[in-house]
Interface confidence: medium
């Protein structure tokens, strides 16, 4: 498994991930106590037939060619947790692992 | 964690579960001894915003709106594996739980 | 239908060859093992080999390895046996037979279909 | 080679009667045993397969039972088109072999 990583500068059309710091201060979310931003990444481009396919699945689709399959789209592939300090609707601190946060690796499916 | 399901007869405009089977002997793929077929769905349909969101990811990414990023889409948020009995490169007969074959659950990401 | 047809029978001298046919319809022949199964005159079923017609793989019972060679031809969807060095005791009725896979294990597999036999008289 | 003991290798009954067919194998066959009925001049025909698996179009008389090494046939209500002769058949293990067979006869 494997991933392109590209930057502001790359020309890379093909799926890829991109830096992306999230700021919860500037959404105003007051809510989240820290950290108040981190690195979380994004992907975007375009998926060419077979290009970073993550599953076979993805490949028998496109053989198959169902009515209204669109195609692969460049999405998160491999993410993992952020450890985050915030208040719940109860307003008590919370201490917890949020899962899915940070976008380790993009690909088609 | 949900999804919806539909079927060809299915009005719904958004990301949804639809049947597939894919069938490797139309294909032509006799290095697959079995499952001749086989049912593996396929996810299709729009991603309105929040609609289905698999992670806070997709959220703050909508939030930040970076260059480029093209919103979710409709992709499997939940797949499983199926047995397959295959020939490798080598023609020995391989028996083996191949990851990610069928979509159990379609979602925004 | 799936169906199996194998050649008419043969009597063949002592040391002679013979090459037996199972032509195949109804299904796609490369995708599906065939097996060839023998019985000799009052007497049980032995199973010779098989072959996977897209590769041309293919098992042997010890036995007749040296007695038997299994191929296909793809493009007429037939698979064929050839016995060498025939004997008396080689008269037999020889089947073949497709292999289906019915499960989710590696030996998941019956017979589904047999062809109706050909009988090899090995006779001086 | 995996051994296929079949008992008895032959047997009289009488139509309606329930019989029962077993066969041995030499070690654990894991269920993977099929059964056949040969009827003279015929191909076999599949009865059986994984043990106690029917195959599609088979009348429901005929049932198999048996794990490891022990495998029984029955037939329930014999008719006469049952009078043939039945063969078991593991295939855990290449060589596939065959039980030597039993004939059933009309008493």
């Known amino acids: 498994d494997f991933g392109l990583d590209c930057d502001e500068h790359s020309t890379e059309s093909r799926c890829c991930r991109y830096p992306l710091t999230v700021d919860f201060e500037a959404f105003g979310w007051d809510w989240i106590i820290a950290p108040k931003r981190y690195k979380a990444n994004y992907c975007s481009g375009e998926c060419e037939f077979v290009f970073l396919q993550k599953y076979p699945h993805t490949h028998l689709v496109h053989q198959a060619n169902p009515r209204g399959s669109a195609g692969p789209c460049c999405t998160p592939t491999k993410m993992s947790p952020i450890n985050m300090l915030y208040f719940n609707g109860k307003e008590q601190i919370i201490y917890g692992k949020i899962p899915a946060m940070v976008v380790d690796r993009c690909g088609c499916s | 964690d949900f999804g919806l399901d539909c079927d060809e007869h299915s009005t719904e405009s958004r990301c949804c579960r639809y049947p597939l089977t894919v069938d490797f002997e139309a294909f032509g793929w006799d290095w697959i001894i079995a499952p001749k077929r086989y049912k593996a769905n396929y996810c299709s349909g729009e991603c309105e915003f929040v609609f289905l969101q698999k992670y806070p990811h997709t959220h703050l990414v909508h939030q930040a709106n970076p260059r480029g990023s093209a919103g979710p889409c409709c992709t499997p948020t939940k797949m499983s594996p199926i047995n397959m009995l295959y020939f490798n490169g080598k023609e020995q007969i391989i028996y083996g739980k191949i990851p990610a074959m069928v979509v159990d659950r379609c979602g925004c990401s | 239908q799936v169906q199996l047809v194998q050649s008419g029978a043969e009597v063949k001298k002592p040391g002679a060859s013979v090459k037996i046919s199972c032509k195949a319809s109804?299904?796609?022949?490369?995708?599906?093992?065939m097996h060839w199964v023998r019985q000799a005159p009052g007497q049980g079923l032995e199973w010779i080999g098989n072959i996977y017609p897209y590769n041309g793989v293919s098992n042997y019972n010890q036995r007749f390895k040296a007695k038997a060679t299994l191929t296909v031809d793809k493009s007429t969807s037939t698979a064929y046996m050839e016995l060498r060095s025939l004997r008396s005791d080689d008269t037999a009725v020889y089947y073949c037979?497709?292999?289906?896979?019915?499960?989710?294990?590696?030996?998941?597999?019956?017979?589904?279909?047999w062809g109706q036999g050909t009988l090899v008289t090995v006779s001086s | 080679d995996i051994q296929m003991t079949q008992s008895p290798s032959s047997l009289s009954a009488s139509v309606g009667d329930r019989v029962t067919i077993t066969c041995k194998a030499s070690?654990?066959?894991?269920?993977?045993l099929s059964w056949f009925q040969q009827k003279p001049g015929k191909a076999p025909k599949s009865l059986i397969y994984r043990a106690n698996r029917l195959v599609d179009g088979v009348p429901s008389k005929f049932s198999g039972s048996g794990s490891g090494q022990d495998y029984t046939l029955t037939i329930s209500s014999l008719q006469p088109e049952d009078f043939a002769t039945y063969y078991c058949?593991?295939?855990?293990?290449?060589?596939?072999?065959f039980g030597q067979g039993t004939k059933l006869e009309i008493k």
């Open positions: 109804g299904y796609s022949f490369t995708g599906y093992f």
């Open positions: 070690q654990d066959i894991n269920s993977y």
């Open positions: 058949l593991q295939s855990d293990e290449f060589p596939l072999t």
């Open positions: 037979a497709r292999r289906y896979y019915y499960g989710t294990g590696p030996a998941d597999w019956y017979y589904d279909v």
